[in-house]
């Protein structure tokens, strides 16, 4: 997704507009400590990474503090002084929002309103997936804010819910990542349950963006 050159595969993730993680997979340099050099401005000198990720004792990535930046990350992955991959990327197009926090459920007869804390930046979709033991697939509903009302539920059934946040593709493009799912919460007759007892092993949720 971040590109490949000279056998180097790159992945970029911008965690919640706070931290950028650049990882690489370089089969040609599998036993080499590649170094990561970067800048956030085209005019600055390159800085070297101070927070490397290691895999089997060798560098495999870098974590950078990048609070609320919408600029370009210029970077070079080097073997000694030799650049093996050089690129520049707008960081926001690799956004991974944080998982929803303070998820709450408000029941009213056959409907539930799921709310959580909206993130501080926009152009996001808040997706609720839910299913009862009688559903073969997860159902899904999403809104622009974390205030999602699901109607037509059966008060007698137990439902499992979880929530995640996604970046709008028309704004951020196709290379973003959905947030991690919130914890699964089970409800029946407007009351929280430890689990939906008769639930078979749930199928994988739909991961479509």
């Amino acid at each position: 997704q971040g590109g490949a050159a000279e056998g180097v595969q790159i992945q970029i993730i911008y965690f919640n507009l706070e931290t950028v993680q650049v990882t690489w997979n370089a089969s040609k340099y599998s036993r080499t400590n590649l170094t990561f050099h970067y800048r956030f401005n085209g005019d600055e000198a390159y800085d070297q990474c101070t927070n490397y990720l290691l895999q089997e004792g060798h560098t495999s990535g870098c974590l950078l503090d990048a609070e609320q930046r919408d600029d370009i990350l210029y970077f070079s992955i080097r073997n000694g002084t030799h650049p093996v991959f050089t690129a520049s990327r707008w960081m926001v197009y690799y956004l991974k929002p944080s998982s929803p926090k303070h998820v709450r459920f408000s029941w009213h007869q056959d409907a539930v309103t799921v709310t959580c804390s909206d993130l501080s930046y926009g152009d996001l979709l808040y997706e609720v997936q839910y299913r009862s033991p009688f559903d073969t697939e997860w159902q899904s509903k999403q809104e622009n804010t974390c205030n999602v009302t699901i109607e037509g539920l059966d008060a007698e059934k137990c439902y499992s819910f979880w929530v995640r946040v996604k970046a709008m593709e028309d704004v951020y493009g196709p290379d973003t990542y959905p947030s991690d799912w919130s914890e699964v919460t089970c409800w029946q007759r407007g009351e929280i349950r430890d689990a939906c007892a008769e639930t078979p092993t749930p199928p994988k949720p739909k991961l479509s963006k």
């Epitope: 590109g3 490949a4 085209g42 050089t86 520049s88």
Partner: antibody
Framework: EVQLLESGGGLVQPGGSLSLSCAAS????????MHWVRQAPGKGLEWVSA????????YYADSVKGRFTISRDNSKNTLYLQMNSLRAEDTAVYYC???????????WGQGTTVTVSS | DIQMTQSPSTLSASVGDRVTITCRAS??????LAWYQQKPGKAPKLLIY???SLESGVPSRFSGSGSGTEFTLTISSLQPDDFATYYC????????FGQGTKVDIK
Amino acid sequence: EVQLLESGGGLVQPGGSLSLSCAASGFTFSRYGMHWVRQAPGKGLEWVSAISASGGSTYYADSVKGRFTISRDNSKNTLYLQMNSLRAEDTAVYYCAKDKWGYAFDIWGQGTTVTVSS
Amino acid sequence: DIQMTQSPSTLSASVGDRVTITCRASQSISNWLAWYQQKPGKAPKLLIYKASSLESGVPSRFSGSGSGTEFTLTISSLQPDDFATYYCLQYNHYSTFGQGTKVDIK
């Protein structure tokens, strides 16, 4: 309809200044990085400058660094290029263009002509 | 800086021909390449991005391929509206255009 409309081009003497504007409509301007690209008469395309969606970060080709300044006013949906110390080689049609997810420039204006001549 | 070399510079073809334009990067750019069409007096129009993704609204006779340093734009059956100049653009590190390929009538 998504549209970009440049203005401000004209004839200027070497060493002079000019300010170009680009009015955006039909999309949420404040969400996207923007660029200026130029094309000298009978020549190919040359990227000139870019600015991030918030306007907080700017980027320039070496050929214009220190002479040109890109800026934007998201409240007015307008992109600007202030050109100082103009040279004959800056003569070109100047296009503003919208960034497409860091892959390319997807929407272009019709261009405005800048002629630097004594 | 990354240099982009297009070939040929000029290409004479007839309606219905299959046309291929190549673009070579001076270093690997993965698939960070776009193709544009420009007609005289008009702004460039995006055809292909990320080497092979067809921009919305662009006819399917246009296709792109390649990765690394070698890229190709193919027009499967040239139409009268396709006579124009075509440019490649690398967007891997900064932005650099190829010098252009003019497709004219044979």
